[in-house]
């Protein structure tokens, strides 16, 4: 009775169960009555990362420096190359196929999370009591100056883009 399903790491072909090729190898011939599945190692700059019946290995990803990419982890016969972006840039997608410059947070916004090679800068509006007067990829919102602790009074209220202006307390005449 020919099988209708096969064990793990096998596949069904011509009414028989054949072994899959291990990661790092490609299929060159299905098993027969007289021989096991025949597999060959992937070539230089190729990989297969699963038990498979692929007749061609996949090419390693190319980290194109013209797109701001560099190699984070070199590929093997069983793993793809992992690309990341040059300093100051981040990937445009999870696959990291190209890079864009880290975004800066405009005045009135501060950096909530600094960008990495794979994620952009996350900005947040400066809440009441905080301000940012620069466009920056690193600066957080700064707290307004506390005039009281300096024995001064607020002469000009702060905004999300400006600090308070402190001045001396009015003397009693």
């Amino acid at each position: 009775e020919p099988p209708t399903a096969c064990r793990e790491k096998q596949y069904l072909i011509n009414s028989q169960c054949c072994s899959l090729c291990q990661p790092g190898q490609k299929l060159v011939s299905d098993c027969t009555e007289f021989t096991e599945t025949e597999c060959l190692p992937c070539g230089e700059s190729e990989f297969l990362d699963t038990w498979n019946r692929e007749t061609h290995c996949h090419q390693h990803k190319y980290c194109d420096p013209n797109l701001g990419l560099r190699v984070q982890q070199k590929g093997t016969s069983e793993t793809d190359t992992i690309c990341t972006c040059e300093e100051g840039w981040h990937c445009t997608s999870e696959a990291c196929e190209s890079c864009v410059l880290h975004r800066s947070c405009s005045p009135g916004f501060g950096v909530k999370q600094i960008a990495t090679g794979v994620s952009d800068t996350i900005c947040e509006p400066c809440p009441v009591g905080f301000f940012s007067n620069v466009s920056s990829a690193f600066e957080k919102c700064h707290p307004w100056t506390s005039c009281e602790t300096k024995d001064l009074v607020v002469q000009q209220a702060g905004t999300n883009k400006t600090d308070v202006v402190c001045g001396p307390q009015d003397r009693l005449r």
Epitope: Q10, S19, V28, S29, C31, T32, E33, F34, T35, E36, T37, E38, L40, T55, H56
Partner: antibody, heavy 114, light 112 residues
Framework: QVQLKESGPGLVAPSQSLSITCTVS????????VHWVRQPPGKGLEWLGV???????NYNSALMSRLSISKDNSKSQVFLKMNSLQKDDTAIYYC????????WGAGTTVTVSS | DVVMTQTPLSLPVSLGDQASISCRSS???????????LQWYLQKPGQSPGLLIY???NRFSGVPDRFSGSGSGTDFTLKISRVEAEDLGVYFC?????????FGGGTKLEIK
Amino acid sequence: QVQLKESGPGLVAPSQSLSITCTVSGFSLPTSGVHWVRQPPGKGLEWLGVIWAGGDTNYNSALMSRLSISKDNSKSQVFLKMNSLQKDDTAIYYCLGHGHFDVWGAGTTVTVSS
Amino acid sequence: DVVMTQTPLSLPVSLGDQASISCRSSQSLVHSSGNTYLQWYLQKPGQSPGLLIYKVSNRFSGVPDRFSGSGSGTDFTLKISRVEAEDLGVYFCSQTTHVPWTFGGGTKLEIK
């Protein structure tokens, strides 16, 4: 049904190269590998190598440096080329289809002699 | 490479006798899948080898049931229960578990 027919030069001078053609029918080269085996007179069988369906090859490591196997799918032909022949390469050369080990060609006799 | 050692080199028999040929491999022929790819061929005088047994004990179609194969791992045996005249020739074992595929040196079955 599956058939294989080997054709070669018969006589080869020492240090010269050998070219043999295997013409197949009853199965398709783009989907099946072809092996080469030889048998010196009165001796045992020796596996030489294989060309797989996709064109990849495996060779007997002892002969790899002077052996090459290629094919022409459109003509259903597989070619064995061996360089620098010596007297002990005198043998009957057989081709056989992968998975069709019940079917061997009649073989072609190659004699290395001056 | 896997070395296949066949014994005896020559086996003189009388017609109707039982014949037994041994084949030993230098390493196990059991593939990780659990299959063992050991074949037996008969080469009659002036002919190409013909397949008798595959995967240790499976008779190829049309092969008489007086031929049987057995064994496991590294030790294999071909038995012919009652030798007939058409069985005479050279018997080869062959392994296709490991590349390169290798053959035994042959056993010549001849009349006493």
